[in-house]
Every structure is written in structure tokens, then in C-alpha cells.
Amino acid sequence: GNLTVAVVLPLANTSYPWSWARVGPAVELALARVKARPDLLPGWTVRTVLGSSENALGVCSDTAAPLAAVDLKWEHNPAAFLGPGCVYAAAPVGRFTAHWRVPLLTAGAPALGFGVKDEYALTTRAGPSYAKLGDFVAALHRRLGWERQALMLYAYRPGDEEHCFFLVEGLFMRVRDRLNITVDHLEFAEDDLSHYTRLLRTMPRKGRVIYICSSPDAFRTLMLLALEAGLCGEDYVFFHLDIFGQSLQGGQGPAPRRPWERGDGQDVSARQAFQAAKIITYKEPDNPEYLEFLKQLKHLAREQFNFTMEDGLVNTIPASFHDGLLLYIQAVTETLAHGGTVTDGENITQRMWNRSFQGVTGYLKIDSSGDRETDFSLWDMDPETGAFRVVLNYNGTSQELVAVSGRKLNWPLGYPPPDIPKCGFDNEDPACNQDHLSTLE
Amino acid sequence: GNLTVAVVLPLANTSYPWSWARVGPAVELALARVKARPDLLPGWTVRTVLGSSENALGVCSDTAAPLAAVDLKWEHNPAAFLGPGCVYAAAPVGRFTAHWRVPLLTAGAPALGFGVKDEYALTTRAGPSYAKLGDFVAALHRRLGWERQALMLYAYRPGDEEHCFFLVEGLFMRVRDRLNITVDHLEFAEDDLSHYTRLLRTMPRKGRVIYICSSPDAFRTLMLLALEAGLCGEDYVFFHLDIFGQSLQGGQGPAPRRPWERGDGQDVSARQAFQAAKIITYKEPDNPEYLEFLKQLKHLAREQFNFTMEDGLVNTIPASFHDGLLLYIQAVTETLAHGGTVTDGENITQRMWNRSFQGVTGYLKIDSSGDRETDFSLWDMDPETGAFRVVLNYNGTSQELVAVSGRKLNWPLGYPPPDIPKCGFDNEDPACNQDHLSTLE
């Protein structure tokens, strides 16, 4: 028989991690693997039908995506949907597929809301999600003894689909659930000079452990401002929520692993400021299959999709689509073996959830509500060389922090700064306000 | 032939102005009129198919509505859609119908965004819209010499679909377009006591001409607070944006036309405070056909829909659906007479736009972009009796303010207060800061 998978992803714009130019080759490789394995869907052909989640400007759209989904449903009555990745595009599509009782598989849609499976029934996320970032940060706080206060700053940038809003939303809500902790959050516009003044006034009053979701340039700017204002590494720690590791990539941007470097006359200060910085990214899979997969992926992208794929963590997304599609096909195969049909979305989905799977991204665990356990890396600066390197990894499945041997977190005082200063944010602790003259009564 | 109109409105919840229990009888009356008129769609049967815009809780939903629209499109391939009325429900449906090139007719969806016909192609609004309120207010400002500054306060109330946000958005944007004027706007939560403190501090610094969109109770509270703070009718004017005239209705609420009355021991003060208040509502049609229509509407609602319809401006909405549907059928009839088909959405829509029509709501003009010109009434207090009455009507078609004979606006000083106080909001006018001691050099 024919198994039809309807794809709703950006078909023209190649800049999204889940653009078809990136995911298409991964799907091709997955389907080639299915063909090569006699145990997967024997006697069946898997075919993909495409719809675009972009509007005429090539931007993800909450109108184009559901319209594409509706058209594909009408014309092809697919067994499953692949994508969308963008939050605003995925939301209406996921609600539609839930209504139709058709499985939706994505390695995007990382926002908190998609974890609510009453609304997004049969949606499986084979990629990372922002609430899982919260699990990592909660574990980090427990390890470092920060159980009282944190501050989260997130950038608004026109046209970036409120990436940082959704990231901080997932992080904030999950950290608050996991720890009994006060978390303040503040939005700023990266291109609005007055906002930096406001942040500068807010940071000392609201946090010592500060998470920042922004572009690499804006993070570096904030670090320079912090240095200037004396918010130094002894008392403060700044985490750059740079999940795809853009600031660590080199290329047109900063030098590889030297996210403070720009050649703008401020590098000396920036390097000093970055002593108080750490960077959080997704973890790069380190299994040999992933490297082999990347080689094939890049080759196929160039040959068949006329697209040159850069290196970087962004490639974990197509890899996760690949693994998710294989997991789906595995679940369909089992459902058929148990007398079910390809239209039995509930049954197929249940076989994907609460399940482990060895994929090109390594060991993959889908939790009991259909979301992948996500691994993260924490990068810190080597004070000798100024280069950043991974010092700690987080295993989402075991929820453990695993130190990289021979490396440790760099703290100017030798230990992490407290999350609330000794005398409180406004020097409100009475013990700190005593007259320093001792008087004899 | 068969002409199918797909209805997407709240089918269970009767509280919306566009609930099916209210609009259904109006549609029945319109279709009865079509049957009775041999010149309208001769030889054709008009049938309605229903889909609900509500979720399981009976609340308008941006998921349920487009899903209903999609299901109706698949099953019935309708020639047109009627509804939705709620902003969040109408938005995705209107974008879908635009994509399908199917006309959408509503007497709801009053928000500014629906005026952008690039996005909402073939959407005709036969009811009032908030940008038209801006046309009225701009005309009022011109008449009263307020061309510099205004303040708009709008209430957030859980579950009211951000009615006041959308109302003030349309008003604000249109007033700003029509006049070169500074307009500040501020949201407040009706149930948050601290917000009233903030408003009290803000009003003297930001406005003398103040528009307030809120429940009648919250408006009365603000008027009492204003009186208490000495923001009196000589210097201030407060407009209650009470478009359906809830505060004027009596019944369970305030006494008819005495919106200040509650019997809570504060009526004397409230009456005094309301000397500085005026109320803006939609205009009640005053043509005899409307009264006759209302009689039939209420009867049909009770008999066939088991719903008892109250009096009030809210009934202008079903009446507008009635007139809009007749206008649509008139346009279809003409299109067919010119060799077109019922599926020719563009042609049919063009025949509805930039057109006048005599309906049960009186003279109805659809502008060149498919939105009805809207009439408003301005109510003011009779200082003798304390009762409010209409002193001024606004004709949306002619864009004229028409005084009600024998009545005039009540100003404590005999003239409208200036929109910026004589010495500026912060007493910044140097002429007001002169030393009052004259010194001889």
C-alpha cells in the first residue's frame, strides 16, 4: 500500500532550521533507510506531499501553514503530517491535526504550549523543546545552590518569530515548577538604545544569576555594559541562551569559540567581561553515526536541493526529523503487525510515546507525553586562552549533569556567586546596615 | 439551483451579540423576505449550513471556528460564509475564505485589522466597526476644538475577548490618522485595585479629554474617584465608550438612562461626578421598519429558538446580519443576471461594496472597502433630572454631526474644557511660572 506523509515546512526560505532544503535531504535519507530495511513497512511505499508554511514573503505564517495543511488533507488524506517547525505556523496546524486525529510529527515547535496534549493531541516532538531547557537549568541551579532568585532577559527582534519570548517562556515556567524560586523576566528590543539603559538599571536590582536570550552581538553588548557598570564575575553570572551555538561558530561572525571577539576596538574589554559569561547550547551528538549522517546530508542537500549546508548545531534539527520519521515508520509497522491500519493515529502515536530509539542523533527518548528528552551543553571560558569549551553536559533522559573530564566551571572567587547578594538586592538586610562603630553602653 | 450559505457563529452560547439564537431568527426573516420577493434569486433556494465558532466551554475560539469553516467547505462547498463575529474566531476564518475566494459576510469582527482587505479579501462587514468610531470621535474633536491631546483608558476583563483593546485600537489608529493629535492609551484590569490608583495618578498628567472603555460599574467607579481627586467637569470630560449602551438600559443594572444610579449610598456623589461624563453608543435606528423587524425577531427567537431577546442596541447586530444577507442576495441576483455564477465571489463582492441599500436598520452604506458606514449617538446628562439623553448623532455616511433639536451639550463653564490645560500638564508653560512679585530695577 501507499503511506502518505504530508509535509508542511518552509519550501523556499532556507534560513529556518526546519527549512525543506535542510529537512528534505534528511527525509530522503530516512526513506532510503526504510527501503533498505525489510523489517520496516514491507510491501509499502512511503511518499511525501509538500505544502509550504510560508507566506509570499517567505516568512512562516499562521495563515499559510493551516491552509496548506487543509489543502493536503483534502487532496491526499495523509496518514501523518511532518512539520511545521515555526511556533505560529505549528499552532493552528497542530490543532487541526488533533481534530482530524492524524499524527503530527515535528522536530520544531519547541514552545511550551505544544506540550499540552489535550490541545495538541497526537503531536510528537522528536526535537528539542524549551521546557526541557528548564529541566536542565533547574538541575544546574540545584547543583550550584541557586534556589532563590534568577533574572531572565529576552530580546525582541523583528522577524525572528519571537524565538526568545517562547524560549524564555518555556524555561521560566519549567524552572518555576521545578524549584520554588523567584524568576523575574524582562523583554528588550535589541535595536532600541534606551532599552539597554533600562536593563543596566534593572540587573543590579533583580538578579545575580542572569539568563539572556538574544543575538550574539546583543549579548556581547550587554556584557560590555555590565563590565562598565561594575557588574563583574565575582558577583554575577550571565548565561547566554544560545541554543544553536551561533556565538561559537566563527565564519562571518565571531572567531570560533571566542564569542567576545569582533575586532572593533573593544575586544580586550569584551574578553574581560566574558569571564562572567557562560553559554548554553543544545548538545552536539557525539556518536559516529551522526558524523556519517551529516556527510550524507550535506552531499544530498547540495546535489538534490541545490543548497550548501553549513556546519553547526542547527543540523541537529534535520537529524531529529530523520530519527522521528523512522520512529513513526517503526510505530506504523508495529501497528500493522497487530492488525491496525495506517489511519489508526491514536495507536500509532501511543507506540511512539514513552519509548527509546537509537537514531543518528544517538539515544533518543520520547517521554510519556510525546516530547523528546533533550541534551544540553554548558560552555565556559578557559581563562588562559579566552576560548570557550564545553565543561558540562546535561543528559535529558537521566536528568543528570555530567562534567567533561579535566574541565571545571570557572568562578573568579573559586565558587559560584550567591543568587541573592549577602545584604539583599537593596541592601535591605538589617545586619548589613549596622553602624560600624562599636559603642560601649 | 441551491445557494448554500455556511454559518460560523456561536451555536450554544447566547450571550454574544452575534449568537445564533439572535442571528438565526434574523436570517430566517431575511430568507422569508427573499422567498416573498420574486425579483430576488428567482428559482433558487437558499439554505444555511451551521458550524460553531465556540469551543467546548461555549467560548469563541480561534481553533473551533476555522475547523468548522474547513468542515463546512469540504462537506457543502458553500457560496458564502456568514460570521464569525468574535475577533479571534473571525481572523483565521477570514484568511481562509480569502484564500478560497469565497465571500464572507459578517456584522461582527469590528476590529481594525479586518479593514485590511489584502488579508481579508471578500470580507464584507455589514455591521459597525471600531475604526468608524474613530471617524466619529475625530469629527467631534474638530467640532469642539480638541486637536492636540486625548487619553484613552481601556479595561481588560477576563473572558471578554479583549473587546476594549480592539475598540480602543480602532479608535486610536483612526483618530491619529484623521487628526494630528497626541493620543496616549493605557490598559487597566477592572478587578485590580492598584490599577485604579495608577489611573488616578495618570489622568491629570496625560489628559483632559478622556475616553474610557469599560463595564458600566468600572466607569462609575472611575468617575467617583475622579470627583474625589478634584478632576471635575470644568476641566475634564470623560467619554464612556459604551457602544451597546449597557449603562443606559436599566433592568438589572442601573435605572433607565441614569447610569450613575446604584442605590449604594454613593448616588449623590456619582450624579455629581457624571456631570463630567458623556456616553458614546451606536445609534438606534429610528425608522419604523426597524421596530417592526424587532417585533418579528423577538417572536421568532422565542418560538423557534427558545430564546427571549432583551431590548437594547445589541439587537442592531442581528438586524445588520439581516440587511447584509439581503444585500448579498441582491448582489448574487445581479451577478446571475449578468451571466455570472454563484461561485463568482469577486464579482458578487464588488456589487456589495461602495453601495447603498435600504434595510431594516435604515439607510445602509457599504464603503469602497466593504465596511459599513456607522452611526453613533452622544449622550449627555440633563442637569435638571440627572437623566442622560442623546444630544448629538453622527451620520457615518455624510460624516456629519447632527444635533438633536432643543438639546445641547452640557459644559459647566459654558464651553468645552481645553484638551491641554492652560499652563500645560506639568505647569510647564513659562508664562504660568512667572514670579508674581514685580520688582523695580
Epitope: L193, G230, G265, S269 | -
Partner: antibody
Framework: EVQLVESGGGLVQPGRSLRLSCAAS????????MHWVRQAPGKGLEWVSG????????GYADSVKGRFTMSRDNAKNSLYLQMNSLRPEDTALYYC????????????????WGQGTMVTVSS | DIQMTQSPSSLSASVGDKVTITCRAS??????LNWYQQKPGKAPKVLIS???SLQSGVPSRFSGSGSGTDFTLTISSLQPEDFAVFYC?????????FGQGTKVEIK
Amino acid sequence: EVQLVESGGGLVQPGRSLRLSCAASGFTFDDYAMHWVRQAPGKGLEWVSGISWNSGTIGYADSVKGRFTMSRDNAKNSLYLQMNSLRPEDTALYYCAKDMGVSLALWGAFDIWGQGTMVTVSS
Amino acid sequence: DIQMTQSPSSLSASVGDKVTITCRASQNIRTYLNWYQQKPGKAPKVLISTASSLQSGVPSRFSGSGSGTDFTLTISSLQPEDFAVFYCQQSFGIPRTFGQGTKVEIK
């Protein structure tokens, strides 16, 4: 009204010193970085020095580094440029300018300028 | 240091003409480029910041574009009051640097 008024210019011999001042009014002085820009007679604009809101970063053009010192007194809404070891090529109209941002780490343009004070270095 | 090179150094144009001035940076400065106008005997005035943001009060006939190393200031229809010297300036790095200026004269 937002304004900057420079003072302290004049005729000075090579090798001597001069101190320029700039008085700011009409805006929150300690919310902005400030700059000195000069213009030699008949020539273009040359950035001399810039200072962040709290003096945390101070930058100089190579041509004045080691000779000029920029400072600010936020309590007095004042900006200063101490010019030592003056040279004939330092002859110029010296403008004080307000940055649109709080720091030199930002990218603010100079949105308010004074009318300038003339410094002439000649023997 | 980042060098800024403007071209042309001067130009003659008539009222109503479209005028284009270019500015090149010696390294990538993103969009951190500002344009100033200076009239004789007056202090400079900022027209455009971050390559394309028109400052309030500046007529809409002025526009800016570009990113990286190449930038343009365009005056769509030259008015009599526009005859002046125009400077570009980078705000990417320290030291800040100006272009050498472009003098726009009446033809």
C-alpha cells in the same frame, strides 16, 4: 530645551594645556554617553574622545591618546576635556556631542551638538 | 581603526535632482552607520542612524541603505536648504570615525 554649551577654548601656545567644559541641560545627563568631536578650519569632522554614562569606558582617537583626558561629573551635568601637550594640529573648533545610547559599547549616533568652542594652538 | 571613505568628495546638483552619496567601511560594521548634515557655521545634525533609520524631524526625501561595508545616502529630490556637507560615521567600534565629507553644491 535640550542643549549643550561648550566653554574654555582660546589661544594657547604649543606644549601648554587647556581644559574644555561642556554644560548639559534638558535631558537626564547620566543616561547617555558623551563625546568630543573637533573640526579643523576648512576640514572635516574628527572624533576626539567618548565617555560612557558612568565613565566606565573612555575612548580616544590615536591622535590624542596620552595627551587628552576626558571626564564627566554627572552631579553637575558637565563634561570635560583636559588637553595637555597641545600641538598646532590640535587647532580646531571643539564640539561636545550627546550620544543616543548609554555607553560606547552601543552604537548610538550623536543626536545633540553644542555650537563648539574654538581652540587655537600657536606660538 | 576602521577607515571610512566617502565618495564623491563633492558634487554639483540642481534643485529637484536625485543625489546619491556612498560610504565604504574598511571592515564589516553591520548596520552601525550614521549620516550627518553640516551647514556652514553650524554644528552637524544627524539625519540617519543605523544605516536606514530616519531621525525625527528629518524630511522623508532623505533615506539611507546598506549594511556590512557599503552604504548609501539618497536625497530623492534636492531642495535649496539641502546644500551642505554630508558626513558618514561608523558607531561599530572605538575609536568612532567619520568619512572625509561630501560637499553638495548648487550647479
